[in-house]
Every structure is written in structure tokens, then in C-alpha cells.
């Protein structure tokens, strides 16, 4: 999916009002010095591409993020504010249902969510214009 035509300001508002708080809840008890951000993004469409990948694609050691509250709210925000996003996700959702697993918060998942917070932070940053 090409995130170029999303309403970035509306997604940002949704993130600040709810999604960010769910991410904090998920990470509660984790030291703020524990993880360095290693996943990066260069502009808002790129950030959303990386956010979608980390949130919804199972990775080795962390298969369960898509069922978390922050993930469901992320999917809703993208569906509302990115034209045509919902249609591209129908097949992915059906595939997801076939491989549902028990919720387990592993250290790998905590690291992945810390990377997500970093990606969202880059997405939210003001446009950095060099004078």
C-alpha cells in the first residue's frame, strides 16, 4: 500500500490521543534506557510503511502484536485516514485469522514495540526544514 495520500495530521491526532497511550501501557515496567532505536524512516509515508510492517507482520520471537489494542487502533486509523487502505487489508486479515496464537509478551515483542514508538516519534516530528 502507498501511504502518500493519507491524512497525516488526522493520523497524528489519533496517535497522540489513544495509540501512544496503549503503547505506553504495553511497555509499562520497561526501562526507558533499555532499547536503542535501530529501525528508521525518512518521511511520513515511509514511516507508516515501517509502522504497518512492524505492527502487523509477525516476526521471529514476536508473533502476536496484531491482536494488541494499539494495533487494532492503528489499523482503524489507517483505514479511516488512508484512502483505499481497508481493501488492501482484507486478504491480510484473513491470513491473520488462520494463524492466531496465544498472546505472549516476550522481550522480543517489547523491543519491537520500542522500535514502533521510535517510528511513530519520527512520524510525529515537525517538518524539519533547514533554513
Amino acid at each position: 500500500y502507498d501511504f502518500t495520500n493519507c491524512d497525516f495530521e488526522k493520523i497524528k491526532a489519533a496517535y497522540l490521543s489513544t495509540i501512544s497511550k496503549d503503547l505506553i501501557t504495553y511497555m509499562s515496567g520497561t526501562k526507558s534506557t533499555e532499547f536503542n532505536n535501530t529501525v528508521s524512516c525518512s518521511n511520513r509515508p515511509h514511516c507508516l510503511t515501517e509502522i504497518q510492517s512492524l505492527t502487523f507482520n509477525p516476526t521471529a520471537g514476536c508473533a502476536s502484536l496484531a491482536k494488541e489494542m494499539f494495533a487494532m487502533k492503528t489499523k482503524a486509523a489507517l483505514a479511516i485516514w488512508c484512502p483505499g487502505y481497508s481493501e488492501t487489508q482484507i486478504n491480510a486479515t484473513q491470513a491473520m485469522k488462520k494463524r492466531r496464537k496465544r498472546k505472549v509478551t516476550t522481550n522480543k515483542c517489547l523491543e519491537q514495540v520500542s522500535q514502533l514508538q521510535g517510528l511513530w516519534r519520527r512520524f510525529n516530528r515537525p517538518l524539519l526544514k533547514q533554513q
Partner: antibody
Amino acid sequence: QVQLVQSGAEVKKPGASVKVSCKASGYAFTNYLIEWVRQAPGQGLEWMGIINPESGDTYYAQKFQGRVTMTADKSTSTAYMELSSLRSEDSAVYFCAKESLTGSSYDYWGQGTTLTVSS
Amino acid sequence: DIQMTQSPSSLSASVGDRVTITCRASENIYSNLVWYQQKPGKAPQLLIYGARNLQSGVPSRFSGSGSGTQFTLTISSLQPEDFATYYCQHFYETPLTFGTGTKLEIK
């Protein structure tokens, strides 16, 4: 807990330079931008610029372009702001601040460093 | 650069009063606005981010509203510790300019 500790007060002569330090602790230093803000006596807040400690990328307010240099030392988790060609109007309290978790504000601030420029 | 104008520049009020401070941006900044409180000799403290989100640990008597070019900070019932100077700052694009400030004094 998160802390930003700045260097002590400075007295400089016009034309000189000053380098203010801001030592960060309690968080992953390279994950968050640092901004610098100053406040002249009895005046409001004035944004000077920001630095990305990870990449070293900087963004300066036009007013300070050519006179300000922001750097960061990852090994000591310290950000620096150097201001050159000082004039009396640069007398102010200089603050560093850390970007918030969400990237939509600056949530922790240093205690401030007082600079006096006088001949 | 985006200019931020606050009004009033100063305001006298009593404990228990409801107080409203306004911040106007020279162009559309959507919801990219923060509010700070500053007391004499201290660093600013973050109150509100994203125009309406209350920073953790800030009392619920503080609230923010608005979007686009017009924003408001409201203190529902003034407490003695609320007498300070308040600044808005836009977070849309660099330079991240501050408002002119509003000094809240005891009547």
C-alpha cells in the same frame, strides 16, 4: 529518572564564544532530539534550534545561522551549544530540552545556564 | 516563519476563577501546538501537547482546545500554584516558535 544537567553560569566579553553543555541521563540519548531555547531577562522564550544526537543533523533558527553550532557526544550522552561573536543582546538563560516519547513536544528541560555578555 | 500571538499578555485573577488564554497562529498548524507553564527562575514545564492532550502528572483542571489557527488553554479553577507565565509553541515545522507569553497574576 530522566535528567538534563547543564553547565554553570558564564561571563563573556563581546566578540567571544561560549559553549554550553547539557548532560542527559535516564533515557536512551540517541533516540530523542534535543532543542535549545533561550530567554533574555524579563523576556519570552526564543527557539534556537535542534539536534538529532544519533545523526548529528541540526536545524537552526535563521536568526542564529552562522553563529550557533550544536553538537552531541554519544559516548557521554552530552549535547553542546556553542554561540560565537557574542554581543550584549545574547545575555540570557539558555535551556536544553529533550523531545518527548511521542515526538510532539519537549517534556524534560535542563535547569538553565545563565550567560552574561559584558565588556 | 509561523508567528504565534498570545492574548492577553497579562491577566489578573483570583483563586477559584476559571481562566482562558488564547494563542493564534499566523497559518494553519492543525493540532500541532503545546502549552508550557513557567515560574520565575525555573525551566518551562509541559502542560498540553497536540493541542488537547494532557501531559502525564499535570492536574486535570488544565485543558487545551482548538485546531488550525486558534487555540485555547483553560484552567477550570485557579489554584495558588497556577500563578505563572504561560507559553504556547507550535510544533508544525521548524522553526518551532513560541507565543509571546501570558503572565497570570493574583488579583
